[in-house]
């Protein structure tokens, strides 16, 4: 058993049918010695008397808020949550496996640049009685500080007969050095509590691996005289690291017809302009990627040819 926060404790339960459970000793936080009784949640049934209460925690029915009283007065509370392990594996019931980029991916994180700021998000089908707490550091043995805000509900969507909720959190490395080579990964830890169930989820990554630039901005077309060709130009996104001579991007320019089946013409360039043939009813799209490290491409910025 360990303390999650004041008066909230997590019992780690290795569960299997007929498991003996965990013996837990609760101590009433009071100088009083006599006349103390214990109850669970809203029930008035007395579970025991004395300054300590020993319970056998076998299942969620044994978790909840234990309260010690004396003469009708509440002395202290202890909320017991369960962290359940089955077949040697901690439960992961609260969050949905996003399966991207691989199975058992519960947390996904992205950074728009090398400033040390990043966003993580996760999915759940649970709508009520749910709380999250996020901690982060660089490295784990001698951790360097990363500050995370509060997790917030960022999107809701319907998937079949299911409603899915997306939560996200923003974090900032306290002493980020954008140009430095990373040797220790960022660690992100999310505590999730649903009703009386505690679970924790972790992700470990280098900022360079989660980079996803914003789309190029100010995408413009300039027709070339007496030609079907156009000059496409764009700019680096405002959120990208500076100077651009050091933090350079490469770009992919795509001409796409109205029909998804039509052949796509693609040009790759390190410049912020390109000359392409603009077909009728086509659109031109440009996306960006770090020039020197193959992390994610940005989303597309698009303009119609007409």
């Amino acid at each position: 058993i360990w303390e999650l926060k004041k008066d909230v404790y997590v019992v780690e339960l290795d569960w299997y049918p007929d498991a003996p459970g965990e013996m837990v000793v609760l101590t009433c936080d009071t100088p009083e010695e006599d006349g103390i009784t214990w109850t669970l949640d809203q029930s008035s049934e007395v579970l025991g008397s004395g300054k300590t209460l020993t319970i056998q925690v076998k299942e969620f029915g044994d978790a909840g808020q234990y309260t010690c009283h004396k003469g009708g007065e509440v002395l202290s509370h202890s909320l017991l949550l369960l962290h359940k392990k089955e077949d040697g594996i901690w439960s992961t019931d609260i969050l949905k496996d996003q399966k991207e980029p691989k199975n058992k991916t519960f947390l996904r994180c992205e950074a728009k640049n090398y400033s040390g700021r990043f966003t993580c998000w996760w999915l759940t089908t649970i709508s009520t009685d749910l709380t999250f707490s996020v901690k982060s550091s660089r490295g784990s043995s001698d951790p360097q500080g990363v500050t995370c805000g509060a997790a917030t509900l960022s999107a809701e969507r319907v998937r079949g007969d299911n409603k899915e909720y997306e939560y996200s959190v923003e974090c900032q490395e306290d002493s980020a050095c954008p140009a430095a080579e990373e040797s220790l990964p960022i660690e992100v830890m999310v505590d999730a509590v649903h009703k009386l169930k505690y679970e924790n989820y972790t992700s470990s990554f280098f900022i360079r691996d989660i980079i996803k630039p914003d789309p190029p901005k100010n995408l413009q077309l300039k027709p070339l005289k007496n030609s079907r060709q156009v000059e496409v130009s764009w700019e680096y996104p405002d959120t990208w690291s500076t100077p651009h001579s050091y933090f350079s991007l490469t770009f992919c320019v795509q001409v796409q017809g109205k029909s998804k089946r039509e052949k796509k013409d693609r040009v790759f360039t390190d410049k912020t302009s390109a000359t392409v043939i603009c077909r009728k009813n086509a659109s031109i799209s440009v996306r960006a990627q770090d020039r020197y490290y193959s992390s994610s491409w940005s989303e597309w910025a698009s303009v119609p040819c007409s």
Partner: nanobody, 123 residues
């Protein structure tokens, strides 16, 4: 919301078998742990059995262990309770329940309940 409808109750002789079904509709059935409870007249609702959302783990009250088997078919949105070697003391209204804490024998850990089906075991 999850709607639960029990069926399969009836009157049987001691020693006989009965299979209860609980059909779920509404939100995704496979997100819920399912349980069976029972209530005899003048008594509190009593835990019988529960099954995890994927059906890989089960949990039983001592009074039914070895006689009752809980199972589920997520493709059919249905949970079953196979009851064998029935005894007169198994007579009760049997309720199906859906929750998100497994295992729990406590009724208030379940969020949705059916209307119940009567099982009567005569000696």
């Amino acid at each position: 919301e999850v709607q639960l409808v029990e069926s399969g109750g009836g009157v049987v002789q001691a020693g006989e078998s009965l299979r209860l079904s609980c059909a779920a509709s509404g939100r995704s059935f496979s997100n819920y742990e399912m349980g069976w409870f029972r209530q005899a007249p003048g008594t509190e609702r009593e835990f019988v059995s529960t099954i995890s959302r994927r059906g890989s783990s089960t949990y039983y009250a001592d009074s039914v262990k070895g006689r009752f088997t809980i199972s589920r078919d997520n493709a059919k949105n249905t949970v079953y309770l196979q009851m064998s070697s029935l005894k007169p003391e198994d007579t009760a209204v049997y309720y199906c329940a859906a929750g998100q804490l497994f295992p729990s024998s406590r009724p208030r850990d379940y969020d949705y309940w059916g209307q119940g089906t009567q099982v009567t075991v005569s000696s």
